[in-house]
């Protein structure tokens, strides 16, 4: 057993059929010694006396908020969590897999630019009595501050006969360094809390490995006389790492129709132009990536051919 | 050339050569990005290898004010992983497939190194670890981790050879 | 399967105009780019221009600019190149060749020799 | 018009040797490079698109690199089929342009 924080504890239970379970023992936070009494929720059942109550806690209809009273007075509340452990694995029941970039991805994040700053996001199909608490730091060993805010419901979306709610939370680094190579992990520990089972999920990374920049932005087209051709120009996005010249990014143009299937023109470059061919009910459209470092390519920025 | 005395380095060479060592260091093992290594127990093998850090001069400013000791760093790092590169690591078993760019690797790490000084000159490099896997699957792990690692280190690299020769040339 | 089918062997004097065709099978046509691609005896590849046949488009190599004429048929599924003024270095094989993506060449046909001599 | 020029213009080597082909550009064109194999009296055919992407049906021995000015065609452990001639293709611009060839034969 160990305390989540004040008066809340999470008590890890080997979960198989007839487990013997963990024994707990409770002490009511009082100077009192005599007449104490315990309950558990809302029940009026004294479930024994004394300023400690032992209890054999082997499924969930043992934890909740165990309280201590005297004489119709409240002395205090210990909530009690469980986190199972299924053969030797900590239970994931709250999230959902993501399966990207690998199965057993409950937790995904991304970083716009290198200032240290990066958001993570999470599914569950759960949709009430469910917090999050969420702790971040560079390296374990020695960690340096990373601060998170709280965690936000950020979408929601059915998914078949389900619903599935997407949170997310923002985090920077106290003391970021853009220009440096890392060589500790960020590390990102959730702790959920459905009713009363308790589950943890972490996730540990390089920011280099998570950038993912906004797409290019104020995509302009200029066509070139006598010819199919047309240039199309962009800027970097705002919230690339800046100067240019260091944070460099490399673009992907293409020209697609509304369909993947359609035929497309294609070009890579480092520049902020490109002189490609503009088809009838196309789009050209550009992304972006790290110039030195094969992280995720950006979404598309894309205008009308005509 | 960056000569230990302070004079500037050819920017546009080392420009053109690091992006290459860029591609290469990700065409060594494009696959290297999608294993999650850190769950291997890295200590003893990346907290051995210099890392350009947030002291070293190599951020825009710091470059601006004295591209030196970021240079030498860089240096120190080309050194290291050329001879991590042409160690028992990469030589052992299992071989490398005979296509692998290791080699060209290796080669375009010993030329940026050179760019950066000249024979007759030297600056400090950093002891490389006696880092001697017994087992074929060892040696394999701590090639993705060296790559990987090596990725890191161009990255920066290149950004600190873009910027110089788009600011800092003659 | 994506086939592209060429016409026979042409031999012509200098000052004449040659067109050859491509009959294009296993896609539908106005889904790929054509282009020409032609090669001299012993000599590497040269591009010479491309049609999209969904709209008639054409784009041509400035060198062949004024001389060639690329055209598509939608309703026989079959591209034409026309090259006028010919001369002795315009001996070569031509091939068509087709893809989805504009700028590089997946499918290709079978070439056809054209002869120039007086 | 990029001019792209490859090296050497032929090579002589044995079954199960590795032979690499490189191609230059006279100007910078990123990753937009192809490779093709043409045997005699074939059309050519793709081996490789946009520097080191593979190309489905195209055996594994195939291996591209580069990006800028320089690229590598690779082929490892040279097989019997493979002895032909090489091209590589830039597409940064048009007119599209042809290296101009690197014959592979047997030694």
């Known amino acids: 057993i160990w305390e989540l924080k004040k008066d809340v504890y999470v008590v890890e239970l080997d979960w198989y059929p007839d487990a013997p379970g963990e024994m707990v023992v409770l002490t009511c936070d009082t100077p009192e010694e005599d007449g104490i009494t315990w309950t558990l929720d809302q029940s009026s059942e004294v479930l024994g006396s004394g300023k400690t109550l032992t209890i054999q806690v082997k499924e969930f209809g043992d934890a909740g908020q165990y309280t201590c009273h005297k004489g119709g007075e409240v002395l205090s509340h210990s909530l009690l969590l469980l986190h199972k452990k299924e053969d030797g694995i900590w239970s994931t029941d709250i999230l959902k897999d993501q399966k990207e970039p690998k199965n057993k991805t409950f937790l995904r994040c991304e970083a716009k630019n290198y200032s240290g700053r990066f958001t993570c996001w999470w599914l569950t199909t759960i949709s009430t009595d469910l917090t999050f608490s969420v702790k971040s730091s560079r390296g374990s060993s020695d960690p340096q501050g990373v601060t998170c805010g709280a965690a936000t419901l950020s979408a929601e979306r059915v998914r078949g006969d389900n619903k599935e709610y997407e949170y997310s939370v923002e985090c920077q680094e106290d003391s970021a360094c853009p220009a440096a190579e890392e060589s500790l992990p960020i590390e990102v520990m959730v702790d959920a809390v459905h009713k009363l089972k308790y589950e943890n999920y972490t996730s540990s990374f390089f920011i280099r490995d998570i950038i993912k920049p906004d797409p290019p932005k104020n995509l302009q087209l200029k066509p070139l006389k006598n010819s199919r051709q047309v240039e199309v120009s962009w800027e970097y996005p705002d919230t690339w790492s800046t100067p240019h010249s260091y944070f460099s990014l490399t673009f992907c143009v293409q020209v697609q129709g509304k369909s993947k299937r359609e035929k497309k023109d294609r070009v890579f470059t480092d520049k902020t132009s490109a002189t490609v061919i503009c088809r009838k009910n196309a789009s050209i459209s550009v992304r972006a990536q790290d110039r030195y470092y094969s992280s995720s390519w950006s979404e598309w920025a894309s205008v009308p051919c005509s | 050339r960056a000569v230990p005395g302070g004079s500037s380095p050819a920017w546009t060479q080392c420009q053109q050569l690091s992006q290459k060592l860029c591609t290469l260091a990700w065409s060594a093992h494009p696959l290297v990005g999608h294993m999650d290594l850190r769950e291997e127990g890295d200590e003893e093998t990346t907290n051995d290898v210099p890392h350009i850090q947030c002291g070293d001069g190599c951020d825009p400013q710091g470059l601006r004010d004295n591209s030196q000791f970021c240079l030498q760093r860089i240096h120190q790092g080309l050194i290291f992983y050329e001879k991590l590169l042409g160690s028992d690591i990469f030589t052992g078993e299992p071989s490398l497939l005979p296509d692998s760019p290791v080699g060209q690797l290796h080669a375009s790490l010993l030329g940026l190194s050179q760019l950066l000084q000249p024979e007759g000159h030297h600056w400090e490099t950093q002891q490389i670890p006696s880092l001697s896997p017994s087992q074929p699957w060892q040696r394999l792990l701590l090639r993705f981790k060296i790559l990987r690692s090596l990725q890191a280190f161009v990255a920066v690299a290149a950004r600190v050879f873009a910027h110089g020769a788009a600011t800092l040339s003659p | 399967e994506v086939q592209l089918v060429q016409s026979g062997a042409e031999v012509k004097k200098p000052g004449a105009t040659v067109k050859i065709s491509c009959k294009a099978s296993g896609y539908t046509f106005s889904d790929y780019y054509l282009h020409w691609v032609r090669q001299a005896p012993e000599k590497g590849l040269e591009w010479m221009g491309w049609i999209d046949p969904e709209n008639g488009d054409t784009e041509y190599a400035p060198k062949f600019q004024g001389r060639v004429t690329i055209t598509a048929d939608t309703s026989t599924d079959t591209g034409y190149l026309e090259l006028s003024s010919l001369r002795s270095e315009d001996t070569a094989v031509y091939y068509c060749?087709?893809?989805?993506?504009?700028?590089?060449?997946?499918?290709w046909g079978q070439g056809t020799l054209v002869t120039v001599s007086s | 018009d990029i001019q792209m020029t490859q090296s050497p213009s032929s090579v002589s080597a044995s079954v199960g040797d590795r032979v690499t082909i490189t191609c230059r550009a006279s100007q910078s064109i990123s990753i937009n490079l192809h490779w093709y194999q043409q045997k005699p009296g074939k059309a050519p055919k793709l081996l490789i698109k946009?520097?080191?992407q593979s190309i489905s049906g195209v055996p594994s021995r195939f291996s591209g690199y580069g990006s800028g000015t320089d690229f590598s065609l690779t082929i490892n452990s040279l097989q019997p089929e493979d002895f032909a001639r090489y091209y590589c293709q830039q597409s940064n611009s048009f007119p599209l342009t042809f290296g101009g060839g690197t014959k592979v034969e047997i030694k």
């Open positions: 060749a087709a893809n989805k993506e504009l700028r590089y060449f997946d499918v």
């Open positions: 946009f520097a080191s």
